[in-house]
């Protein structure tokens, strides 16, 4: 049966959380990928930016749920019109930054 | 170390405006809601609305809608609470106070962890 | 709007004896999440308030474990194992699950 949106939500916190827990060295070796905007739309928005990432086992299950959450497919070298113009950043920061999102959205109820 | 210091305590006259500044350090304001909560002479607390610093969402109590404008401004650390068409029943402290999400917790509790010193204001003609 | 009923109002204890506080909301206060966002916060003579208990029984950090939060749905208890002098201040309840968030009325803990 389908998860419940707010369980979903909850699994996708979850594994962020450990991402940044379980982080010794530079996640994905110190990887740049685009900053978004935290607005509507965010969930395709950070999947079209961290399916730019290749060969980080560590946030693949990310991706993965991203993608379920995510209506339309995405694929690499999308660019989103949420993402922000000509910045780069870390990936540990974009995790760091979407987590932050993602509990103030669980907390407001904001599941979809 | 984590705090909020207010701005210092004010005279206002009936029907004038307010407004109130509370400076954070020790963390960055967009991780947090920025609370205000009010306290009449001898009386209880009462929460009068919070604001998102990342978005500028806000929310406030319906008998304070209109009259009420809590603004956040990330580049200084700083929230404001303003209140306007002010009465005798307005002479209060206000309280600004953070809720903050924890890194290592899914779960977080998003409760009011720190307060600032509190200003008070007196309307009085 | 939820109201919070706090009782006793004034409560004096004798300093080593267990006290007990009352809250009870005007509605069932779980959020759409599934948490309860009811807590407990101490006011002591002249300061700003502190947060002691979170979600129904989390203790806040630095919190003495003397204090313990209990209770669920529209009632809530936060008990005092062994009160000391340092404790007396006013005790408020709030529910931060449906917006406007509310206190109660406040119980003013002295000691005998």
């Known amino acids: 049966s389908p998860v419940p949106p707010s369980t979903a939500l909850k699994e996708l916190i979850e594994e962020l959380v450990n991402i940044t827990q379980n982080q010794k060295a530079p996640l994905c070796n110190g990887s740049m990928v685009w900053s978004i905007n935290l607005t509507a739309g965010v969930y395709c928005a950070a999947l079209e930016s961290l399916i730019n990432v290749s060969g980080c086992s560590a946030i693949e299950k990310t991706q993965r749920m991203l993608n379920g959450f995510c209506p339309h497919k995405v694929s690499a070298g999308q660019f989103s019109s949420l993402r922000v113009r000509d910045t780069k950043i870390e990936v540990a920061q974009f995790v760091k930054d979407l987590l932050v999102h993602l509990k103030k959205l669980f907390r407001e109820g904001q599941f979809n | 170390q984590v705090q909020l210091v207010q701005s210092g305590a004010e005279v206002k006259k009936p029907g004038s405006s307010v407004k109130v500044s509370c400076k954070a350090s020790g963390f960055y304001i967009k991780d947090t809601y920025m609370h205000w909560v009010r306290q009449a002479p001898g009386q209880g607390l009462e929460w009068m609305g919070t604001?998102?610093?990342?978005?500028?969402?806000?929310k406030y109590v319906p008998k304070f809608q209109g009259r009420v404008t809590i603004t956040a401004d990330e580049s200084t650390s700083t929230a404001y609470m303003e209140l306007s068409s002010l009465r005798s029943e307005d002479t209060a402290v206000y309280y600004c106070a953070r809720s903050i999400y924890d890194d290592y917790h899914v779960d977080d509790y998003y409760a009011m962890d720190y307060w600032g010193q509190g200003t008070l204001v007196t309307v009085s003609s | 709007d939820i109201v919070m009923t706090q009782s006793p109002l004034s409560l004096p204890v004798t300093p080593g004896e267990p006290a007990s506080i009352s809250c009870r909301s005007s509605?069932?206060?779980?959020?759409?999440?599934?948490?309860?966002?009811l807590e407990w916060y101490l006011q002591k003579p002249g300061q700003s308030p502190r947060l002691l208990i979170y979600k129904i029984s989390d203790r806040f950090s630095g919190v003495p474990d003397r204090f313990s939060g209990s209770g669920s749905g529209t009632d809530f208890t936060l008990k005092i194992s062994r009160v000391e002098a340092d404790d007396v201040g006013i005790y408020y309840c709030f529910q931060g699950s449906h917006v406007p968030w509310t206190f109660g009325q406040g119980t003013k803990l002295e000691i005998k």
């Open positions: 509605q069932n206060i779980v959020h759409i999440n599934g948490n309860t966002y």
């Open positions: 604001i998102d610093p990342a978005n500028g969402n806000t």
